[in-house]
């Protein structure tokens, strides 16, 4: 057992059927030492007296808030919590497994350039009586700060039968160095509970890798005289990381048919100008990524031919 | 060339080959073998290497105020890295295909140490860890590992010699 | 389908050599390395050594010096000698592919039936 | 080398219950966070056969009963709800330094 926050209490057990469980002495916070009375939960039916409680915690019947009474009157709760092993391995019952990149992703993170400012989110199908609480660190054994703020709801879906949501949070590194290479990573860590279940989901990473810059911005184009070709041009992100002479970023022109079977002309520059054939009812996009590590694309920036 | 003395390296010439650094060390990368180990590999392997870190002024700032710290640090790095992929770690079993980049990611690393050290100048050396694997599985592991290492260091190098380029040349 | 068979005396005299055969089929010796293991009667089972798919091998060093592995890739064979065998070298004898490097991480994947080797005069 | 030591070295549990084997190295077998620590069940008569794979891989084809856990020196193989063909010697063995090695054995038999 150990203390989640002041009062509350998270009780680790293996989970399996005629599991015997954990013994668990509660204290009641309290210089009375006599006269002491336990309840579960809304329930007036005594458990014991005395300024302990001992009890066998085996299942989410036996967690919930033990509250210890004097005459009436309240002395102090304890909230149990439950955290599920099975076989082994940490339930992860209350998010959903993202998949992405890999099996077993509940936390997806990505940042806009190498500010150290990243945001993290997941998803539940869950709707109610969930709260979730983050934090993170630069490493693990020394670890260096990060200011996280509080998770929110960002989004709903509907998938098939079921609500989807999304919570996202956003975190800053206290001092973030964007022109070094990092050589400790990001830890995340998020508790999550739902009703009388605790989980905790963690991932980590370096900022390197979750690098996925905004679409380029005011994308143009300007015909070229007596030519089908086009001059495209567009400019760096704002939320991209200065100077732009060291933090370079690459680009892929994409001409693309109203038809998704059209063969699509990709080009690669490093410029933030390209030349390209502009067909008829077709449309022009521009993504970027950093131009000396490969993590993620940006989005695409379109704009029509015509 | 960066000489120790402090004369400026040939930022273009510097430039291109980082550049060709990091396109070598991602092309290299899924060609060293399957690999599912890598997933789950997560203690961090390459601790010992030399990292660009944040007081070795190869930010925009301290390549203005002196590029030689930060250059110094990029060769000491490419040296390091040069005497990992020719050890017993990437030479060993499992044996790499004959055309793998990492030949010539190799010549590469030494070829951009050599611009910023011509013969007859020496700066300090890092001495490269003793990762003793013993097992096919565990170099295979390794070679994942130091080539995303790799990876997050030529990519820091190509930025300085970009902004060199592009605002220290002469 | 990945089968790997071994092949050899059923009986063998102490001082004698001992040459066992695997052939394997379904995989290639260039992309999978063969242990041989052996499991003396009601006991456990001993890693007796391995040969890699470049060709390079390793040997338990309790019995390193009797020891060789070697190998035809053409042929998909792979052959144990064990030379001064002696009765508690009574065992049946494995031959063992051990899975990919990448995934695996040493574990063997595929067994041959094995071939029991009893070493009396 | 490296000492794989297997407990307890036979088991009896009734069908439907679940059985623990524990294997102690008397080394880490762990390199840079991977665990080089497999289980094989062998039935009489037969080669053994791969089960879990890197500690907690499930081998393809293996029932989702059996399960493994641990890291470094410690780890175990669970069999949730022991059927009738489970009845089997299971044995660890570490592949993380030469020579391989593999622990004595844990017999599994019905109560």
């Known amino acids: 057992i150990w203390e989640l926050k002041k009062d509350v209490y998270v009780v680790e057990l293996d989970w399996y059927p005629d599991a015997p469980g954990e013994m668990v002495v509660l204290t009641c916070d309290t210089p009375e030492e006599d006269g002491i009375t336990w309840t579960l939960d809304q329930s007036s039916e005594v458990l014991g007296s005395g300024k302990t409680l001992t009890i066998q915690v085996k299942e989410f019947g036996d967690a919930g808030q033990y509250t210890c009474h004097k005459g009436g009157e309240v002395l102090s709760h304890s909230l149990l919590l439950l955290h599920k092993k099975e076989d082994g391995i940490w339930s992860t019952d209350i998010l959903k497994d993202q998949k992405e990149p890999k099996n077993k992703t509940f936390l997806r993170c990505e940042a806009k350039n190498y500010s150290g400012r990243f945001t993290c989110w997941w998803l539940t199908t869950i709707s109610t009586d969930l709260t979730f609480s983050v934090k993170s660190s630069r490493g693990s054994s020394d670890p260096q700060g990060v200011t996280c703020g509080a998770a929110t709801l960002s989004a709903e879906r509907v998938r098939g039968d079921n609500k989807e949501y999304e919570y996202s949070v956003e975190c800053q590194e206290d001092s973030a160095c964007p022109a070094a290479e990092e050589s400790l990573p990001i830890e995340v860590m998020v508790d999550a509970v739902h009703k009388l279940k605790y989980e905790n989901y963690t991932s980590s990473f370096f900022i390197r890798d979750i690098i996925k810059p905004d679409p380029p911005k005011n994308l143009q184009l300007k015909p070229l005289k007596n030519s089908r070709q086009v001059e495209v041009s567009w400019e760096y992100p704002d939320t991209w990381s200065t100077p732009h002479s060291y933090f370079s970023l690459t680009f892929c022109v994409q001409v693309q048919g109203k038809s998704k079977r059209e063969k699509k002309d990709r080009v690669f520059t490093d410029k933030t100008s390209a030349t390209v054939i502009c067909r008829k009812n077709a449309s022009i996009s521009v993504r970027a990524q950093d131009r000396y590590y490969s993590s993620s694309w940006s989005e695409w920036a379109s704009v029509p031919c015509s | 060339r960066a000489v120790p003395g402090g004369s400026s390296p040939a930022w273009t010439q510097c430039q291109q080959l980082s550049q060709k650094l990091c396109t070598l060390a991602w092309s290299a990368h899924p060609l060293v073998g399957h690999m599912d180990l890598r997933e789950e590999g997560d203690e961090e392997t390459t601790n010992d290497v030399p990292h660009i870190q944040c007081g070795d002024g190869c930010d925009p700032q301290g390549l203005r105020d002196n590029s030689q710290f930060c250059l110094q640090r990029i060769h000491q790095g490419l040296i390091f890295y040069e005497k990992l992929l020719g050890s017993d770690i990437f030479t060993g079993e499992p044996s790499l295909l004959p055309d793998s980049p990492v030949g010539q990611l190799h010549a590469s690393l030494l070829g951009l140490s050599q611009l910023l050290q011509p013969e007859g100048h020496h700066w300090e050396t890092q001495q490269i860890p003793s990762l003793s694997p013993s097992q096919p599985w565990q170099r295979l592991l390794l070679r994942f590992k130091i080539l995303r290492s790799l990876q997050a260091f030529v990519a820091v190098a190509a930025r300085v010699f970009a902004h060199g380029a592009a605002t220290l040349s002469p | 389908e990945v089968t790997l068979k071994e092949s050899g005396p059923v009986l063998v005299k102490p001082t004698e050599t001992l040459t066992l055969t695997c052939t394997v089929s379904?995989?290639?010796?260039?992309?999978?390395?063969i242990s041989w293991i052996r499991q003396p009667p009601g006991k456990a089972l001993e890693w007796l050594g391995v040969i890699w798919t470049g060709g390079g091998t390793n040997y338990n060093s309790g019995i390193k010096s009797r020891l060789t592995i070697s190998k035809d890739n053409s042929k998909s064979q792979v052959v144990l000698t064990m030379t001064n065998m002696d009765p508690v070298d009574t065992a049946t004898y494995y031959c063992?592919?051990?899975?990919?490097?990448?995934?695996?991480?040493?574990?063997?994947?595929?067994w041959g039936q094995g071939t029991t080797v009893t070493v009396s005069s | 080398d490296i000492v794989m030591t297997q407990s307890p070295d036979s088991l009896a549990v009734s069908l439907g219950e679940r059985a623990t084997i524990n294997c102690r190295a008397s080394?880490?077998?762990?390199?840079?966070?991977?665990?080089?620590m497999h289980w094989f069940q062998q039935k009489p008569g037969q080669p053994p056969k791969l089960l879990i794979y890197?500690?907690?891989n499930l081998e393809s084809g293996v029932p989702d009963r059996f399960s493994g856990s641990g890291s470094r020196t410690d780890f175990t193989l669970t069999i949730s709800s022991l059927q009738a063909e489970d009845v089997a010697v299971y044995y660890c063995q570490q592949a993380n330094k030469d020579p391989y090695t593999f622990g004595g054995g844990t017999k599994v038999e019905i109560k």
């Open positions: 379904g995989f290639s010796l260039t992309s999978y390395a």
């Open positions: 080394e880490s077998v762990d390199y840079y966070g991977i665990s080089s």
């Open positions: 890197r500690a907690s």
């Open positions: 063992v592919r051990e899975g990919d490097y990448g995934s695996y991480a040493g574990a063997m994947d595929y």
